[in-house]
Interface confidence: low
């Protein structure tokens, strides 16, 4: 018979014959022959392969380096990599979560819309008219301007998104 030019799913072509791929969690030790099946071996501890493969070496599990603020979210298996996340108080710098940074502060003029979590950073929003924030904070929302009227005072200086209004005494009309 003609040697195959293509193989079925979960097979690979070598030396003009189709060999079975190794299943996830196992690595290739030796290709199949006319007389023997593909030989595979399980990955060692702290190693994995997540696809049907013909790899001769398993991949090392990701190391969640505590010095980078990382901790293990999900322990790796022979078929899956370790998933890292950040310690509380930090957030991942990328989707792959290779390192962590302190939660972002919202600059003056911005308030915290949503406090950060282990996987998402602080969400800031601009202070709307009538509100202000004069500090850089990872916690504080925009504060409303002081109401001078309720204190029987008048606005001497208008507020901005970064400063409160300044209240002062009402001008007394002279008789």
């Amino acid at each position: 018979p003609e040697p195959p030019t293509a193989c079925r799913e979960k097979q690979y072509l070598i030396n003009s014959q189709c060999c079975s791929l190794c299943q996830p969690g196992q690595k290739l030790v030796s290709d199949c022959t006319e007389f023997t099946e593909t030989e595979c071996l399980p990955c060692g501890e702290s190693e994995f392969l997540d696809t049907w493969n013909r790899e001769t070496h398993c991949h090392q599990h990701k190391y969640c380096d505590p010095n980078l603020g990382l901790r293990v979210q999900q322990k790796g298996t022979s078929e899956t990599d370790t998933i890292c996340t950040c310690e509380e108080g930090w957030h991942c710098t990328s989707e792959a979560c290779e390192s962590c940074v302190l939660h972002r502060s919202c600059s003056p003029g911005f308030g915290v819309k949503q406090i950060a979590t282990g996987v998402s950073d602080t969400i800031c929003e601009p202070c709307p008219v009538g509100f202000f924030s004069n500090v850089s904070s990872a916690f504080e929302k925009c504060h409303p301007w002081t109401s001078c009227e309720t204190k029987d005072l008048v606005v001497q200086q208008a507020g901005t998104n970064k400063t409160d209004v300044v209240c002062g005494p009402q001008d007394r009309l002279r008789a």
């Epitope: 302190l102 939660h103 972002r104 502060s105 500090v135 904070s137 916690f139």
Partner: nanobody, 121 residues
Framework: EVQLLESGGGLVQPGGSLRLSCAAS????????MYWVRQAPGKGLEWVSS????????YYADSVKGRFTISRDNSKNTLYLQMNSLRAEDTAVYYC??????????????WGQGTLVTVSS
């Protein structure tokens, strides 16, 4: 020059209490969110607790929630950590830290020198 000086650490039995203090100087303490972090022997840094500038908002790691209380006295430029029901796993060097204003690429801009808390019978 910014300085953060922790005190109050020591040897305590499991179930005991300690109160850590952190005296701050060289910056406007009342406008700075502050943090306690710790490092157990041979381990990485672990965030313990945070407090906003007014003391109105406090945050805790799950491992210390209900046992530790963070507070501050802005008139004394001092940060506190009241630690109750201490466990062996709380053994660590405790650092107070000042949050960086621009925190895109760094965690804290200033640290104290740390105070050692040992929980052992």
């Amino acid at each position: 020059e910014v300085q953060l000086l922790e005190s109050g650490g020591g040897l305590v039995q499991p179930g005991g209490s300690l109160r850590l203090s952190c005296a701050a100087s060289g910056f406007t303490f009342k406008t700075s969110p502050m943090y306690w972090v710790r490092q157990a022997p041979g381990k990485g840094l672990e965030w313990v607790s945070s407090i906003d500038r007014t003391g109105g908002h406090t945050y805790y790691a799950d491992s210390v929630k209900g046992r530790f209380t963070i507070s501050r006295d802005n008139s004394k430029n001092t940060l506190y950590l009241q630690m109750n029901s201490l466990r062996a796993e709380d053994t660590a060097v405790y650092y107070c830290a000042k949050q960086a204003l621009l925190t895109d690429a760094k965690r804290f801009d200033y640290w104290g020198q740390g105070t050692l808390v040992t929980v052992s019978s």
